[in-house]
Amino acid sequence: IWELKKDVYVVELDWYPDAPGEMVVLTCDTPEEDGITWTLDQSSEVLGSGKTLTIQVKEFGDAGQYTCHKGGEVLSHSLLLLHKKEDGIWSTDILKDQKEPKNKTFLRCEAKNYSGRFTCWWLTTISTDLTFSVKSSRGSSDPQGVTCGAATLSAERVRGDNKEYEYSVECQEDSACPAAEESLPIEVMVDAVHKLKYENYTSSFFIRDIIKPDPPKNLQLKPLKNSRQVEVSWEYPDTWSTPHSYFSLTFCVQVQGKSKREKKDRVFTDKTSATVICRKNASISVRAQDRYYSSSWSEWASVPCS
Amino acid sequence: RAVPGGSSPAWTQCQQLSQKLCTLAWSAHPLVGHMDLREEGDEETTNDVPHIQCGDGCDPQGLRDNSQFCLQRIHQGLIFYEKLLGSDIFTGEPSLLPDSPVGQLHASLLGLSQLLQPEGHHWETQQIPSLSPSQPWQRLLLRFKILRSLQAFVAVAARVFAHGAATLSP
């Protein structure tokens, strides 16, 4: 058993039918010694008396808010949550496996630049009685600070019969060094509590591996005289690290016909313009990637040829 | 060329070669990007590689003030990785494919280190740790980790030279 926060405790249980469970001793936070009684949740049934209460925690029915009273007055509370370990594996019932980029990916994170700011998100089908708490650091043995905000519900979607809820959190490394080569990964830890179930999820990454630039901005076409060719130009996204002479991007320019089956013409360039042939009803799209490190491409920015 | 006395390197040549290094490092093992090698006991392997750290002056401001600190750090790293790529980690079993870009990568590391420091001038270099994995699968894992680390190192070096070529070239 360990303390998650003040008056909230997590009991770690080997989880199988008829498991012996864990013996837990609760102590009433009071100088009083006599006349103390204990109850669980809203029930008025007295579970025991005295300054300490010993319970055998086996199932969710044994978890909840234990309260010690004296003469009708509440003295203190202890909330017991359960953390299930099945066959040596901690339960992951609360969050959905996003399966990208690999199985057992519960947390996904992205950064728009090298500033040390990043966003993580996760999915669940649970809509109520759900709380998240996020902590992060650079490295784990001698951790350096990363400050995370509160997790918020960022999207809701319908997937078949189920509703899916997306939560996200923004974090910022306290003393980021954008130009340095990272040697210690960022660690992100999410505590999830659903009713009386506790779970924790972790992710470990380098900022360089989660970089995904915003799409190029101000995408424009300039027809070239007496030609089917056009000059496409664009700019670095505002959110990208500066100076651009140091934090450089490379670009992919694509000409795509109306039909998905039509052959796509692609050009790669380090410049912020390119000359391409604009077919009727086609569109031109441009996306960006770090020039020197193969992290994710941005989403496409597009304009119609006409 | 960057000499210990402090003259400027051939920024544009360094830029071209460092960008080539980036391409080679990723083609040497493109799938490394999809392997979570940090799950595989890192301790004794890539902890000793030289990293370009915050105080090494490789940021745009540091390069403007005095690029020598940064260039020396880059040179150290290039020599370190050049030795690693020439060691039995890469020459031993399992053999690299004949068309593997590791050979080109090795040669380019040497080429860039010589651009930074011609013969006759010496910056101190870092000792290469004695990594001699016994099993072929350990060697394979170590190659992945070294290439992964090299990808990060050459990316920073390439940024330095691109910025230098754009803003510090005479």
Epitope: W15, Y16, P17, E59, D87, D93 | -
Partner: antibody
């Protein structure tokens, strides 16, 4: 006392389908992960599939992936295995068991024979 | 997938003898995620040991498990008549969980 009782086995032609059920009692079924394990006649044990307590996560052996579907109805305390595109090599006694992988409690098994 | 091998295939012993059954994994089994089961003819298997050395509920203390990484052992200190059966090891540290082919302990 934990009890698991499988049903739904029988003779089926190759390419056919069968749905196995496992009725659970003696424990809070909805709280626990469940699995199916099979044993070909005279052969060893093979883990087939498992499902978490809520039904939200399922896992399959490569040999049955895409053909078998594990599911559960917590309101009925019942575990299911829907088997489609059956092959001769699926002939086995199918056991339902508690747990993701470590089978602490087992049913008595139901025999599935795939033959023309 | 992790392959499990068991030796010997058959062990012929008398009641009161000590039985030592071996199980080997093709690669390391993380955190000693290894279980042993006993199966008698016409019956479902029964869990004996999990986490390499922890006895399951109701299993007599003549059964003990040991080992780590790739090499594991099940020891029956003094065979009782009801112990003659087939014994399977199973790794569950890596998905999918895989069983060994079994060791048959029969009466000499």
């Amino acid at each position: 006392e934990v009890q698991l009782l499988e049903s739904g086995g029988g003779l089926v032609q190759p390419g056919g389908s069968l749905r196995l059920s496992c009725a659970a009692s003696g424990f809070t079924f909805s709280n626990y992960s469940m699995s199916w394990v099979r044993q070909a006649p005279g052969k060893g044990l093979e883990w087939v599939s498992s499902i978490r307590s809520s039904g939200g996560r399922t896992d399959y052996a490569d040999s049955v992936k895409g053909r078998f579907t594990i599911s559960r109805d917590n309101s009925k305390n019942t575990l299911y295995l829907q088997m489609n595109s059956l092959r001769a090599e699926d002939t086995a006694v199918y056991y339902c068991a508690t747990g993701i992988a470590v089978a602490r409690y087992w049913g008595q098994g139901t025999l599935v024979t795939v033959s023309s | 997938d992790i392959q499990m091998t068991q030796s010997p295939g058959t062990l012929s012993l008398s009641p009161g003898d000590r039985a030592t059954l071996s199980c080997r994994a093709s690669q390391s089994v993380g955190s000693d995620y290894l279980a042993w089961y006993q199966q008698k003819p016409g019956q479902a298997p029964r869990l004996l040991i999990f986490a390499a050395s922890t006895r399951a509920t109701g299993i007599p203390d003549r059964f003990s498990g040991s080992g780590s990484a790739t090499d594991f052992t099940l020891t029956i200190s003094s065979l009782e008549p009801e112990d003659f059966a087939v014994y399977y090891c199973q790794q569950y540290g890596s998905s999918p969980a895989t069983f060994g082919p079994g060791t048959k302990v029969d009466i000499k």
